[in-house]
C-alpha cells in the first residue's frame, strides 16, 4: 500500500569534491531508476565549528527510511556527517537538523544551500 | 542506547492468530521506517515485512502476503504484526529491527521472541 | 526475487586466520549489500552496508568490497569473539533476501 506518494523526478546537485570527482559542482540532478523504484532526493553536509559544509546533494533511490518524507531532515544526535532524504522535486534545496535525544524542545536549523 | 522489545509470542494451532509487538526506546521511533525479520529453528534469516516513518507504506514477503499485517503507533513508541491463519511454517523466532538512516541495512534488532504453530 | 547465494556454507578457522566469505546475487544490486553477524542464541549484528561502509563500532579487521553480483567480506585477523554465522542481505528491492548464511567454527 502507497499513500499520498509524491513523486521524485529532480533534485537539487551539489558535490564539494567535484573536481576529484569530476562531476558539476551544483545544478539540477534529474533522477533516474527502474520504474518500480521510489526516488528521493538526499543532502549530506558537516557542521564544523558551527559553520555548515555540505558534502553532497542530489538523488537518491529507493529507501523506505525515505518514504513519506516531504522534508529533508536529520534527526541523529550529533552525527560525524548529517544526513537526509525526502520525497518531492528538489525537496533537498533545503534542510534541517532536529536532534532527536534532546529533553528541552529542539529548535530548527534551517539550511539554504550557498555553494563556496 | 537503542532498545527494541518483542513480546507476544507463543504457541498457537494452525489456523489461529497471533499479535506481536515491539517496544522502542532510546531513539525516535517515528523517524526509522521499521521492519520484521524471523528466523526458523536451525535455519536462516527472513525478511517479513515493512513499514514507512508514517505508516503510509507497507511491504510484506510473499510468504505471509494477505495473513499478516504491519502497523505502528508512533506516539507509543510501539511496532505491531498482526499475524492470523497462521501455518506451522510460520514457526520462528520474530525479530523487530530498524532501518538506519542512510544505510539501507537492518542497525539495530531486538532479542527476539518465539512464535511456534503446531497442534 | 532477487537469490542471494553464500560460500561457503561453514569454515574452519583458527585465531589470526584471514577470512574470506563470498556472496552472489542473482542480478545486480549496484552496492546495495549488507553483512550480518550472528552468535547462537542472539539477534543479528549489522557489520557492514552499502557493500563496504563499516558500521558504527564494528573493528576494522571486518571489511566489504565488490559491486554489482559479487560480494566478499573479509576479517584480516580472526578473533575469538569472530566464531559466529554471517549472513549477507541486498536492500536493492524488495522483498529484501539474505544469503543461506556462513557459519565461522574453530578449527
Known amino acids: 500500500a502507497i499513500l499520498g506518494r509524491s513523486e521524485t523526478q529532480e533534485c537539487l546537485f551539489f558535490n564539494a569534491n567535484w573536481e576529484k570527482d569530476r562531476t558539476n559542482q551544483t545544478g539540477v540532478e534529474p533522477c533516474y531508476g527502474d520504474k518500480d523504484k521510489r526516488r528521493h532526493c538526499f543532502a549530506t553536509w558537516k557542521n564544523i565549528s558551527g559553520s555548515i559544509e555540505i558534502v553532497k546533494q542530489g538523488c537518491w533511490l529507493d529507501d523506505i527510511n525515505c518514504y513519506d518524507r516531504t522534508d529533508c531532515v536529520e534527526k541523529k544526535d550529533s552525527p560525524e556527517v548529517y544526513f537526509c532524504c525526502c520525497e518531492g522535486n528538489m525537496c533537498n534545496e533545503k534542510f534541517s537538523y532536529f536532534p532527536e535525544m534532546e529533553v528541552t524542545q529542539p529548535t530548527s536549523n534551517p539550511v539554504t544551500p550557498k555553494p563556496p | 542506547e537503542v532498545q527494541l522489545l518483542e513480546s507476544g509470542g507463543g504457541l498457537v494451532q494452525p489456523g489461529g492468530s497471533l499479535r506481536l509487538s515491539c517496544a522502542a526506546s532510546?531513539?525516535?521511533?517515528?523517524?526509522?521506517?521499521m521492519a520484521w525479520v524471523r528466523q526458523a529453528p536451525g535455519k536462516g534469516l527472513e525478511w517479513v515485512s515493512a513499514?514507512?516513518?508514517?505508516?503510509?507504506?507497507?511491504y510484506y514477503a510473499d510468504s505471509v502476503k494477505g495473513r499478516f499485517t504491519i502497523s505502528r503507533d508512533n506516539s507509543k513508541n510501539t511496532l505491531y504484526l498482526q499475524m492470523n491463519s497462521l501455518r506451522a511454517e510460520d514457526t520462528a523466532v520474530y525479530y523487530c529491527?530498524?532501518?538506519?538512516?542512510?544505510?539501507?541495512?537492518?542497525?539495530?534488532w531486538g532479542q527476539g521472541t518465539l512464535v511456534t504453530v503446531s497442534s | 526475487d532477487i537469490q542471494m547465494t553464500q560460500s561457503p556454507s561453514s569454515l574452519s578457522a583458527s585465531v589470526g586466520d584471514r577470512v574470506t566469505i563470498t556472496c552472489r546475487a542473482s542480478?545486480?544490486?549496484?552496492?546495495?549489500l549488507n553483512w550480518y553477524q550472528q552468535k547462537p542464541g542472539k539477534a543479528p549484528k549489522l557489520l557492514i552496508y552499502?557493500?563496504?561502509t563499516l558500521q558504527t563500532g564494528v573493528p576494522s579487521r571486518f571489511s566489504g568490497s565488490g559491486s554489482g553480483t559479487d560480494f566478499t567480506l573479509t576479517i584480516s585477523s580472526l578473533q575469538p569473539e569472530d566464531f559466529a554465522t554471517y549472513y549477507c542481505?541486498?536492500?536493492?528491492?524488495?522483498?529484501?533476501?539474505f544469503g543461506g548464511g556462513t557459519k565461522v567454527e574453530i578449527k
Open positions: 529491527a530498524r532501518h538506519g538512516s542512510g544505510t539501507r541495512a537492518f542497525d539495530s
Open positions: 532510546g531513539f525516535t521511533f517515528s523517524n526509522y521506517a
Open positions: 513499514i514507512s516513518v508514517t505508516g503510509g507504506s507497507t
Open positions: 542480478q545486480s544490486i549496484s552496492r546495495h
Open positions: 552499502e557493500a563496504s
Open positions: 542481505q541486498q536492500s536493492y528491492s524488495t522483498p529484501w533476501t
